[in-house]
Amino acid sequence: PHLRTFTDHFQTCKVQGAWPLIDNNYLNVQVTNTPVLPGSAATATSKLTIIFKNFQECVDQKVYQAEMDELPSAFADGSKNGGDKHGANSLKITEKVSGQHVEIQAKYIGTTIVVRQVGRYLTFAVRMPEEVVNAVEDRDSQGLYLCLRGCPLNQQIDFQAFRANAESPRRPAAASPSPVVPETFPYETAVAKCKEKLPVEDLYYQACVFDLLTTGDVNFTLAAYYALEDGKMLHSNKDKLHLFERTRELPGAVA
Amino acid sequence: CKILKCNSEFWSATSSGSHAPASDDVPEFCAALRTYALCTRRTARTCRGDLAYHSAVHGIEDLMSQHNCSKDGPTSQPRVRTLPPAGDSQERSDSPEICHYEKSFHKHSAAPNYTHCGLFGD
């Protein structure tokens, strides 16, 4: 999936299986990614588990679990708030669109989470105070906290190289993320479809093009569009909303 | 069981929660505590088997001794905020300040810096 980190780095990751997205003193988010096509290195999120840890007189521990075709509007225990403590309403789930869009507000940690199902796969977005982001007991154990550190270098897909291949008349080589490229989606069509929803040619737009070329699934256009929309709602600095390609930096920075 | 109503009335009467009041606020704090104790006694019949009730009772006892409040004395008219209609266990009235990050954050510094992370697509 495409990852926008807390430090505004944008990466395309092939991380497969279960990975920690956020892991701090208050909250743990784990995603499970699966290949979008047989033999493809590109993966998308098929499962998401969020654990809100027990916190003072505010909330009991609550677990939220979403999977493909199952986006619940309640925690795993059936409740929609933080339990039986006095501050239970400082954690609330709101169903925005049944089966498609859920918002979780954790006021006690100033955090808003948006989970969507777009097509077959899930998207995740969060707004969190820096103080909460950095509230970790053991900094050494935080190496693979994706939202904070990004994907390991060996798990990143070279977005720009793929795009260069796609723009050339040849089809991408077998070494590219998706050997099974659907012939039904020429580069021009992908560009046109993405332009419709994402007029600014930023990294969300580039991600959209990449996804259409990789899968041929137009739902990924919506995934990029909603990711940008959620960013508009959740990002505190509107000037930083659109990310653009930078020249290659240090390893682990923007892919 | 209306123990949560007692809790929220106490929290709103002592707007800084159960943190130590300034010395000149102690009589007012003790009055609010006695009101809280009276409220919990009234809920005893319908809350006596629930944890929230026992937590409140023990909490009151602790605060009473911490602040040297006498059991007898004036009670306060709490500055009650409008509460939502009484509901089931999934519905709660006002949360303590500690359960509202922005409110408690503003107590000790400027507005928090927010960050954003997103994951989507393939």
Epitope: D60, D77 | R45, C47, G49, D50, L51, H54, D88, Q90
Partner: antibody, heavy 115, light 112 residues
Framework: EVQLVESGGGLVQPGGSLRLSCAAS????????MNWIRQAPGKGLEWIGM????????HYADSVKGRFTISRDNSKNTLYLQMNSLRAEDTAVYYC????????WGQGTMVTVSS | DVVLTQSPLSLPVTLGQPASISCRSS???????????LEWFQQRPGQSPRLLIY???ERFSGVPDRFSGSGSGTDFTLKISRVEAEDVGVYYC?????????FGQGTKLEIK
């Protein structure tokens, strides 16, 4: 959503014993007092007893005192009713209910005491 | 033990019309500090009881506002402002002021 599911009912002979269970979900079970209530066929409701959230106190109706015991296992989110020395008049649907005073009830389990 | 006596035991009502059920206690249900713990339950045919009203007059969550409770001391009333088909069933009053907790014998509401 609060859910209470009773089980363990069935046919038992007078003088026999039976243990009913009530599996709770959708709320923090260990925070609440719990009740057992019964309803004889075609009759009204009768409160049997209640147990505090931490099992520190139990209260019973006179009709079952000494014969019935309420217990709970908070680690399993389960409430129990141990019924001994059963009589024909104990035949009823047995309900568990959440709270010191009952708000949410289970669907009930039928206990028939007959020879 | 506190005895709760309901009347009438059977209540035929026309759809859309109001209905009223009385519950009388053998002793005052008011505690010394003025609190009264009386509840009303509805039991539809073949279903478990459901809490409607607690503390005499407080509607439980999800209960339509056509249901209301009132009373004090020993006399209590449950009112339905406009009876609907789904209101058919047996209604019980219940007291929690004294141990043992007790129910009224029930009032059966049916549609005329």
């Amino acid at each position: 959503e609060v859910q209470l599911v009773e089980s363990g009912g069935g046919l038992v002979q007078p003088g026999g014993s039976l243990r009913l269970s009530c599996a709770a979900s959708g709320f923090t079970f260990s925070n609440y007092g719990m009740n057992w209530i019964r309803q004889a066929p075609g009759k009204g409701l009768e409160w049997i007893g209640m147990i505090y959230y931490d099992s520190s106190e139990k209260h019973y109706a006179d009709s079952v005192k000494g014969r019935f015991t309420i217990s709970r296992d908070n680690s399993k989110n389960t409430l129990y009713l141990q019924m001994n020395s059963l009589r024909a008049e104990d035949t009823a649907v047995y309900y568990c209910a959440k709270g010191t005073t009952p708000d949410y009830w289970g669907q009930g389990t039928m206990v028939t005491v007959s020879s | 033990d506190v005895v709760l006596t309901q009347s009438p035991l059977s209540l035929p009502v026309t759809l859309g019309q109001p209905a009223s059920i009385s519950c009388r206690s053998s002793q005052s249900l008011e505690e010394s500090d003025g609190y009264t713990f009386l509840e009303w339950f509805q039991q539809r045919p073949g279903q478990s009881p459901r809490l409607l009203i607690y503390d005499v007059s407080e509607r439980f969550s999800g209960v339509p506002d056509r249901f209301s409770g009132s009373g004090s001391g020993t006399d209590f009333t449950l009112k339905i402002s406009r009876v609907e088909a789904e209101d058919v069933g047996v209604y019980y009053c219940f007291q929690a002021t004294y141990d043992p907790l007790t129910f009224g014998q029930g009032t059966k509401l049916e549609i005329k």
